[in-house]
Interface confidence: medium
């Protein structure tokens, strides 16, 4: 229904706390370089204005769209051009073009330092002095680094953050309590960020229909007892919600997400038997819980999928009369039977089925032609199953760090033109798939591995799109979203690449490495490894092992030396010489 004042409507629906959080996220995602203090001032002004509209919906400007109101606020910032350059040109445009322009200027890799977690004592002090400001900083810092983070979910993580601090800051050993808990929240949030970026990429590149297909498959796996009409209602709603968030309509997105949670809880009987525990929670936790819900039990008496989609003599007639419904039903029926498949795989199978009908229904004997379609799925299913098997075996053999290194070598060989920091980030994230998925029960491994890898590779594509350097990466990234992971997996050593010349300074290290945290040390070593591969793309595994082993020993030895600087200065050149020799 239409409201006189959109902003008053959202303020009333969301409540002041969530409203302010969402406005802060919106501003931080649009203007990623502005300091917290500047954004919080704007947030307060918008909140005060919203309150005047709640009091009187006919008050001046209350009838303006939220995009207009937000855009006007952002464009009024002094020195906008100095700080943001061409983003300021957006301000010359009218809505909706102005908002589109802001969206196009979102930076997936902003030049911001990594978010450093303060020391436990300091963190607790500032949290206890002003919890609102502390959590505001958290929203701001995460949102500006992840401009597509799903806003209502970020509010949920802020709530988690709040819970952890409230609990741990009363403990005697604050650090021991905080570190593992905050690490867990951070890990979940980072995965959520890449997953949501993938959803926005899907929406931006391939439109709502592609996203809805993804949602139908996902919902059908989770809710196999819900009928198709129910699944498509949920998929349509989820598509709308994600479109809003990806488009910067964060207030509407959060409001609609809460509405969907309410609907699901009111209609549990026709959706899933697993929802009750989620439905007893407050709104943010309820939505999050529903998003992470375990799969319902598959109905016991499901007939073979072949009956309707291969054996029925009317297959081509049904397909011709209602393509979307017929293919949608196929995707639903196949997905509800296969919670053990990834969504990407299910969409590949649906695409294969569609291509088969397109071809066969135009031929003389369609049933003979499409009669083997289900058997033709086999290689498509085997390929990701083998990927999971070989990668999980490698992970179990090497551990996370060793597995990351193996992935780094592989991907540097596939795309040596890509910048080393991007390759290291991608390989570290891809390598985490082992820890995340390989320990799961067999039936959960494939969906976990492939859907996670797809999200990480989407991040690689997004970064590569900004500065394209590898034709192979461009080719994999330009194709269909569901074919990306197989495309990357199929890449081999890039034979067109001219090896980088050996630069001694790339492999020169100083005593500062000794005081780095383990993670930073690993990144330094992995940076060196990527550079080695760029120098010798065809180096054997043994050669790389020798050089990296030497390197690890060298760092270890010099970090234990009395005169560290001297050790690095004298031993370093020897290491470089030995490495060159080993790789010759």
């Amino acid at each position: 229904e239409a409201h006189k004042s959109e902003i008053a409507h959202r303020f009333k629906d969301l409540g002041e706390q969530h409203f302010k959080g969402l406005v802060l996220i919106a501003f931080s995602q649009y203007l990623q370089k502005c300091p917290y203090e500047e954004h919080i001032k704007l947030v307060q002004e918008v909140t005060d204005f919203a309150k005047t509209c709640v009091a009187d919906e006919n008050a001046e400007n209350c009838d303006k769209s939220i995009h207009t109101l937000f855009g006007d606020k952002l464009c009024a910032i002094p020195k906008l051009r100095d700080n943001y350059g061409e983003l300021a040109d957006c301000c010359a445009k009218q809505e909706p073009e102005r908002n589109e322009c802001f969206l196009q200027h979102k930076d997936d890799n902003p030049n911001l330092p990594p978010f450093q977690r303060p020391e436990a004592e300091a963190m607790c002090t500032s949290f206890q002095e002003n919890p609102t400001s502390f959590l505001g900083h958290y929203l701001h810092e995460v949102a500006r680094r992840h401009p597509y983070f799903y806003a209502p979910e970020l509010l949920y993580y802020a709530e988690k953050y709040n819970e952890v601090l409230t609990q741990c800051c009363t403990e005697s050993d604050k650090a021991a309590c905080l570190t593992p808990k905050l690490d867990a929240v951070k890990e979940k949030a980072l995965v959520a960020a890449v997953r949501q970026r993938m959803k926005c990429s899907s929406m931006q590149r391939f439109g709502e229909r592609a996203f809805k297909a993804w949602a139908v498959a996902r919902m059908s796996q989770r809710f196999p007892n819900a009928e198709f009409a129910e699944i498509t209602k949920l998929a349509t709603d989820v598509t709308k919600i994600n479109k809003e968030c990806c488009h910067g309509d964060l207030l509407e997105c959060a409001d609609d997400r809460a509405e969907l949670a309410k609907y699901m809880c009111e209609n549990q009987a026709t959706i899933s038997s697993k929802l009750q525990a989620c439905c007893d929670k407050p709104v943010l936790q309820k939505s999050q819980c529903l998003a992470e819900i375990e799969h319902d039990n598959i109905p016991a008496d499901l007939p073979s999928i072949a009956a309707d989609f291969v054996e029925d003599k009317e297959v081509c007639k049904n397909y011709a009369e209602a393509k979307d419904v017929f293919l949608g039903t196929f995707l639903y029926e196949y997905s509800r039977r296969h919670p053990d498949y990834s969504v990407s795989l299910l969409l590949r199978l649906a695409k294969k089925y569609e291509a088969t009908l397109e071809k066969c229904c135009a031929e003389g004997d369609p049933p003979a032609c499409y009669g083997t379609v289900l058997a033709e799925f086999q290689p498509l299913v085997e390929e990701p199953k083998n990927l999971v098997k070989t990668n999980c075996e490698l992970y179990e053999k090497l551990g996370e760090y060793g597995f990351q290194n193996a992935v780094l070598v592989r991907y540097t060989q596939k795309a040596p033109q890509v910048s080393t920091p991007t390759l290291v980030e991608a390989a570290r994230n891809l390598g985490r798939v082992g820890t995340k998925c390989c320990t799961l029960p067999e039936a959960q491994r494939l969906p976990c591995v492939e859907d996670y890898l797809s999200a990480i590779l989407n991040r690689l594509c997004v970064l590569h799109e900004k500065t394209p350097v590898s034709e192979k990466v461009t080719k994999c990234c330009s194709g269909s979203l569901v074919e990306r992971r197989p495309c990357f997996s199929a890449l081999t050593v890039d034979e067109t690449y001219v090896p980088k010349e050996f630069k001694a300074e790339t492999f020169t290290f100083h005593s500062d490495i000794c005081t780095l945290p383990d993670k930073e040390k690993q990144i330094k070593k992995q940076t060196a490894l990527a550079e080695l591969v760029k120098h010798k793309p065809k180096a054997t595994e043994d050669q790389l092992k020798t050089v990296m082993g030497d390197f690890a020993q060298f760092v270890d030895k010099c970090c234990k030396a009395a005169d560290k600087d001297n050790c690095f200065a004298t031993e370093g050149p020897n290491l470089v010489a030995r490495s060159k020799e080993a790789l010759a």
Partner: nanobody
Framework: QVQLVESGGGLVQPGGSLRLSCAGP????????MGWYRQAPGKERELVAF???????NYNDAVQGRFTISRDNSKNTLYLQMNSLRAEDTAVYYC??????????WGQGTLVTVSS
Amino acid sequence: QVQLVESGGGLVQPGGSLRLSCAGPGFLLRSNTMGWYRQAPGKERELVAFIRPSGLTNYNDAVQGRFTISRDNSKNTLYLQMNSLRAEDTAVYYCHTRPPFQRDSWGQGTLVTVSS
């Protein structure tokens, strides 16, 4: 548009029986809630009964105990068994589903007249 075709209507005496059939694509009948509606002359269209994919059924109070909705998946057909018919059951009966991504699908209707 999805095609649904009703049959089985006709003239019957009060207290008599009729069985209506609705033929449609099997994939649709199995995956969606299917329903029978009716529209008496000069009145609004009303729900008579529906059946979910799980087999769960639901009836309008006015027909409860007299009418039975069922489907035969092997024949891709939805049925409405109508017993103890009354004059007020006279109407055009429609088979219905709401396939997702599309407008509602209705059959062309079959006329049931209960009269002595």
